[in-house]
């Protein structure tokens, strides 16, 4: 009897370890999306970027969905969201539209139940990129902890999209779930 | 029999609490490394920074290894990586070699199995640090979520290392494990 | 006997699932605090920002306390801390006191047991905001992984507080617990 119970206990421990590990894995959605360099719009207006990679190089996604430029939440929770956006210009690309630039990023959340869009985080800088220098570069990083519900969508808006650095290490955004909602 | 089983159940619960807590702790490597101010290289070229503290002040490491300027992964997993790099110049340090600067950071991953180095994240800015101002300062922050395998190494490269701010609150990088690989 | 044990095992699994889920939730304090725009100090000196929202819009707090401008740790652990601080100036607000600005943020930790304050992270930039441009903007982001003890307090200091952007998506700071202390 006693040995039998101990064997059951070992089974409990074993199955629990599997279950805990499995549920932990399943409970932690994440995404790291990198800019799709083949489809960067031009202009100095603010635009919602629609083309991101989710499955090549550093880009990856699990238990979240990527569709038409939006990162879709599949699981309620508190997530850490982040974005890194790099802008650059080389004189060989031709003159800048203006030397006074507003280089900005906005991380927005859209609720499809109530069609509305809200900015969660913003960052950036006004820059004077003078013709005296042949190369200009500037990066923005933002990050924060947010409650996200299943079905909500995260997207990235930037100003001056034609100046985006198309490298996967330069322009990306992502999210990972930290904890459940109580 | 029934009481005995209940006692065993209590033991299971108790041992499980310990086991879960312990395995959770062991499953979460981290590091926060701060610049070693006594060994900052000079020059304006791009260099890999090799001297970091791992056990004084805010610096700490657990279940990861620091060796020869590289943060070595001991446990497969998805990690959040970050870096904060500050540059500064005071006129009392003498004139800058040039007023047009490219202040950059690159967070790189090296795989020793396949000797290759890849940039995971980059950030920075071109700056015009004119002689009209006696003090100049600029900080870069980058962060992202990456799959790391045991044995892979993370290192930090910067341009203009002689301009680095040597404070532990200024120039640092780190990582913490968020979840296992499926 | 054997059926009874299996029933007990099922109970163990069930109660454990509840317990694990509950303890996981309780073990993860977090906060995301957004600037209180109605109470931003003026001036160009460095000040500790004391007015933050903790329960409206994106602002939230759980298992941590906010009091007198400080985020108080209630539970020992390793936390990821972050701050995003935006500065802006529009010519319609009148002339700047000086065109040469030092826009900085300092994330500080105060220990009430040993009354002392230490800077965990800093970031920022010197800026030349010339009168040639009608609008200026600049954002700082910092983040890092720190060991925090119950009773310790996190606060935010900035230079030039009168230039702070009062939007909740612009100026905020936060923390979330990643793991226990061994």
């Amino acid at each position: 009897g006693s040995q039998h119970i101990r064997a059951e206990k070992a089974m409990v421990d074993g199955s629990w370890l599997d279950l805990a590990k499995r549920s932990k894995l399943e409970a932690q959605p994440f995404a790291h999306l990198t800019i799709n360099a083949t489809d960067i719009p031009s202009g100095s207006h603010k635009v919602s970027l629609s083309s991101w990679y989710h499955d090549r190089g550093w880009a990856k996604i699990s238990n979240m969905t990527f569709s038409n430029g939006k990162l879709i939440v599949n699981q309620d929770g508190f997530y850490y969201l982040y974005a890194n956006i790099c802008f650059r210009h080389h004189e060989t690309s031709g003159d800048l539209a203006t030397e006074y630039l507003q280089l900005m990023v906005y991380v927005t959340k859209t609720s499809i139940k109530i069609p509305s869009s809200h900015t969660l985080m913003k960052g950036g800088s006004t820059k004077y990129w003078s013709g005296n220098s042949e190369f200009h570069f500037y990066s923005i990083n933002v990050g924060g902890f947010f409650k996200l519900r299943s079905g909500e969508e995260i997207s990235i808006e930037v100003s001056n999209p034609s100046l985006l650095d198309p490298d996967q290490d330069a322009t990306y955004f992502g999210a990972f779930k930290v904890r459940d909602i109580d | 029999g029934s009481q005995h089983i209940r006692a065993e159940k209590a033991m299971v619960d108790g041992s499980w609490l310990d086991l879960a807590k312990r395995s959770k702790l062991e499953a979460q490597p981290f590091a926060h490394l701060t610049i070693n101010a006594t060994d900052i290289p000079s020059g304006s070229h791009k260099v890999s920074l090799s001297s970091w503290y791992h056990d004084r002040g805010w610096a700490k490491i657990s279940n990861m290894t620091f060796s020869n300027g590289k943060l070595i992964v001991n446990q497969d997993g998805f990690y959040y990586l970050y870096a904060n790099i500050c540059f500064r110049h005071h006129e009392t340090s003498g004139d800058l070699a040039t007023e047009y600067l490219q202040l950059m950071v690159y967070v790189t991953k090296t795989s020793i199995k396949i000797p290759s180095s890849h940039t995971l994240m980059k950030g920075g800015s071109t700056k015009y640090w004119s002689g009209n101002s006696e003090f100049h300062f600029y900080s870069i922050n980058v962060g992202g979520f990456f799959k790391l395998r045991s044995g892979e190494e993370i290192s930090i490269e910067v341009s203009n290392p002689s301009l680095l701010d040597p404070d532990q609150d200024a120039t640092y990088f780190g990582a913490f494990k968020v979840r296992d690989i499926d | 006997g054997s059926q009874h044990i299996r029933a007990e095992k099922a109970m163990v699994d069930g109660s454990w699932l509840d317990l694990a889920k509950r303890s996981k939730l309780e073990a993860q304090p977090f906060a995301h605090l957004t600037i209180n725009a109605t109470d931003i100090p003026s001036g160009s000196h460095k000040v500790s920002l004391s007015s933050w929202y903790h329960d409206r819009g994106w602002a939230k707090i759980s298992n941590m306390t906010f009091s007198n401008g400080k985020l108080i740790v209630n539970q020992d652990g390793f936390y990821y801390l972050y701050a995003n601080i935006c500065f802006r100036h529009h010519e319609t607000s009148g002339d700047l006191a000086t065109e040469y600005l030092q826009l900085m943020v300092y994330v500080t930790k105060t220990s009430i047991k040993i009354p002392s304050s230490h800077t965990l992270m800093k970031g920022g930039s010197t800026k030349y905001w010339s009168g040639n441009s009608e609008f200026h903007f600049y954002s700082i982001n910092v983040g890092g992984f720190f060991k925090l003890r119950s009773g310790e307090e996190i606060s935010i200091e900035v230079s030039n507080p009168s230039l702070l952007d009062p939007d909740q998506d612009a100026t905020y700071f936060g923390a979330f617990k990643v793991r226990d202390i061994d």
Epitope: D39, H45, K46, V47, S50, T98, E99, L101, E157 | - | E134
Partner: antibody, heavy 117, light 108 residues
Framework: QEQLKESGGGLVTPGGTLTLTCTAS????????MSWVRQAPGRGLEWIGY?????SPYYANWAKGRFTISRTSTTVDLKMTSLTTEDTATYFC?????????????WGPGTLVTVSL | DMIQTPASVEVAVGGTVTINCQAS??????LAWYQQKPGQPPKLLIY???TLPSGVPSRFKGSGSGTQFTFTISDVECTDAATYYC????????????FGGGTEVVVK
Amino acid sequence: QEQLKESGGGLVTPGGTLTLTCTASRFSLINIGMSWVRQAPGRGLEWIGYIYSGGSPYYANWAKGRFTISRTSTTVDLKMTSLTTEDTATYFCARHASDGGWYLDIWGPGTLVTVSL
Amino acid sequence: DMIQTPASVEVAVGGTVTINCQASQSIGSNLAWYQQKPGQPPKLLIYLASTLPSGVPSRFKGSGSGTQFTFTISDVECTDAATYYCQQAYTASNVDNAFGGGTEVVVK
């Protein structure tokens, strides 16, 4: 209430030049994008181009070379050269959304430009 | 650049009308819809494909992303008689026209 008003329209002969001006009232054009759009009689809307604060403009393919957009902190101008009868239309100026998006949330009433001998 | 269909549509009061807009390339959610009544300038009804500015009735609905977009008016009222235009707000280079050709909505 925030308003825009176009001025400078009227009759012009083919080959001529005309400059239209857009003036804002009760809001500043600082840090705001502005578009020019035209509409020929009985036809649809046609985007001409836009300009942002301190910036150089972007134009529709057909407008490059003949149309020039410029701005001050209070006005936005549209200069049109080598005008033809095809340019006869009502010309609108419109403000971009204050967040920088290319969404036209305030429009002027329009000014009619007639190109005729 | 933007193809809008149909060119004209008739709808009864209380009915529903649907207008389609197709972009020549993917524009994500960067699309706006406008209403224009005779002798007036256009009025912004929807931006970012589905977001309503304040003051616009919820009877107006936008959807879609990428290259296919839909604009719907439900519970149509007499005052909805107007011409409706879509506008891409994605790229400002190599643009022939940012606007669609328009759809005239006639209310019976």
